[in-house]
């Protein structure tokens, strides 16, 4: 999906009002310096591409993020504010339903959510100095 035509300000508002708090709740008890940055993004569409990938694509050691509250709210925000996004996700959602797994918060998942926090911060904070 090409995120170029999303309403970035509306997505930013959704992040600030709820998604950010859900991410903090998920990470509670984890030191903010525990994980180094291993993923970045270079503009708002790119950030959303990487956020979608980390949030909804199962990875080795962390297959359970899509059912988390922050993930469901992320999905809702993208569906509302990115034209045509919902249609592209129907097949992916059906495949995910077949893959229901026991919910376990692994260290790998914590690391992945830490990376998500960094991506969302970049999405919301273009460089302080535009030079």
């Amino acid at each position: 999906y090409d995120f170029t035509n999303c309403d970035f300000e509306k997505i930013k508002a959704a992040y600030l009002s709820t998604i950010s708090k859900d991410l903090i709740t998920y990470m509670s008890g984890t030191k903010s310096t525990e994980f180094n940055n291993t993923v970045s993004c270079s503009n708002r569409p790119h950030c959303l591409t990487e956020i979608q990938s980390l949030t909804f694509n199962p990875t080795a050691g962390c297959a359970s993020l899509a059912k988390e509250m922050f993930a469901m709210k992320t999905k809702a925000a993208l569906a509302i504010w990115c034209p045509g996004y919902s249609e592209t996700q129907i097949n992916a959602t059906q495949a995910m339903k077949k893959r229901r797994k026991r919910k376990v918060t692994t260290n790998k998942c914590l690391e992945q959510v830490s990376q998500l926090q960094g991506l969302w911060r970049r999405f919301n904070r273009p460089l302080l100095k535009q030079q």
Epitope: T38, S40, S42, H46, E50, P126, L127, L128, K129, Q131
Partner: antibody, heavy 122, light 108 residues
């Protein structure tokens, strides 16, 4: 463990070519801008070239423009520097370095390789 | 093209504060990054975006930037701080990375 490992350095005659490679591991390579920086013996750091996260744009220092080419293969997590028409003044340790970017602005080099030595001598 | 000027050398007594400057035209409008390089090693980022510090760098390292001068401050200097220090900016007008000439810090 996030790591950059350079290879391909060596001794080469003036006018000849050399290809440096940089293997990335431990991070999502495709999301970072990548640079080459060099350091002549006993001298300071000199930036050489940059390539955007998606490979869509490159830029070079005036001293290497037209002779060096930076490329990347995001599927293999590798960065390359093709160096043609080498001169004695290109003798240096060559480092690859990772840099987050925002649009067309590059941020700090937060991860560096250990460097590979290139000596141009007849 | 944009030029960054650093003093070639700075000395500090153990336990004292060292200040390394980086001069550039209206540098305060740019984000300045600082690197430490010890002999035979690759550079290491110690301060980025003027004053932020990577999690692995001790609090003794700090930075500031305004007007035409950026400053790296190293408090409670230690023998292990002896190294070359480089400032760096991204010059968006020319799409070039610019490094200062480097400053050799000696802990007396």
């Amino acid at each position: 463990q996030m790591q950059l490992v350079e290879s391909g350095g060596g001794v080469v005659q003036p006018g000849r070519s050399l290809r440096l490679s940089c293997a990335a591991s431990g991070f999502t390579f495709r999301t970072y801008g990548m640079h080459w920086v060099r350091q002549a013996p006993g001298k300071g750091l000199e930036w050489v070239a940059v390539i955007w996260y998606d490979g869509s744009y490159t830029h070079y220092a005036d001293s290497v423009k037209g002779r060096f080419t930076i490329t990347r293969d995001n599927s293999k997590n590798t960065l390359n520097l093709q160096m043609n028409s080498l001169r004695a003044e290109d003798t240096a340790v060559y480092y690859c370095a990772r840099s987050p970017q925002w649009e067309d602005i590059f941020e700090a080099f937060d991860i560096w390789g250990q460097g590979t030595m290139v000596t141009v001598s007849s | 093209s944009y030029v960054l000027t650093q003093p070639p050398s700075v000395s500090v007594a153990p336990g004292q504060t060292a200040r390394i400057t980086c001069g550039g035209n209206n540098i305060g409008s740019k984000s300045v990054h600082w690197y430490q390089q010890k002999p035979g090693q690759a550079p290491v980022l110690v301060v980025y975006d003027d004053s932020d510090r990577p999690s692995w760098i001790p609090e003794r390292f700090s930075g500031s930037n305004s007007g035409n001068t950026a400053t790296l401050t190293i408090s409670r200097g230690e023998a292990g701080d002896e190294a070359d220090y480089y400032c760096q900016v991204w010059d968006s007008s020319s799409s070039l990375v610019v490094f200062g000439g480097g400053t050799k810090l000696t802990v007396l």
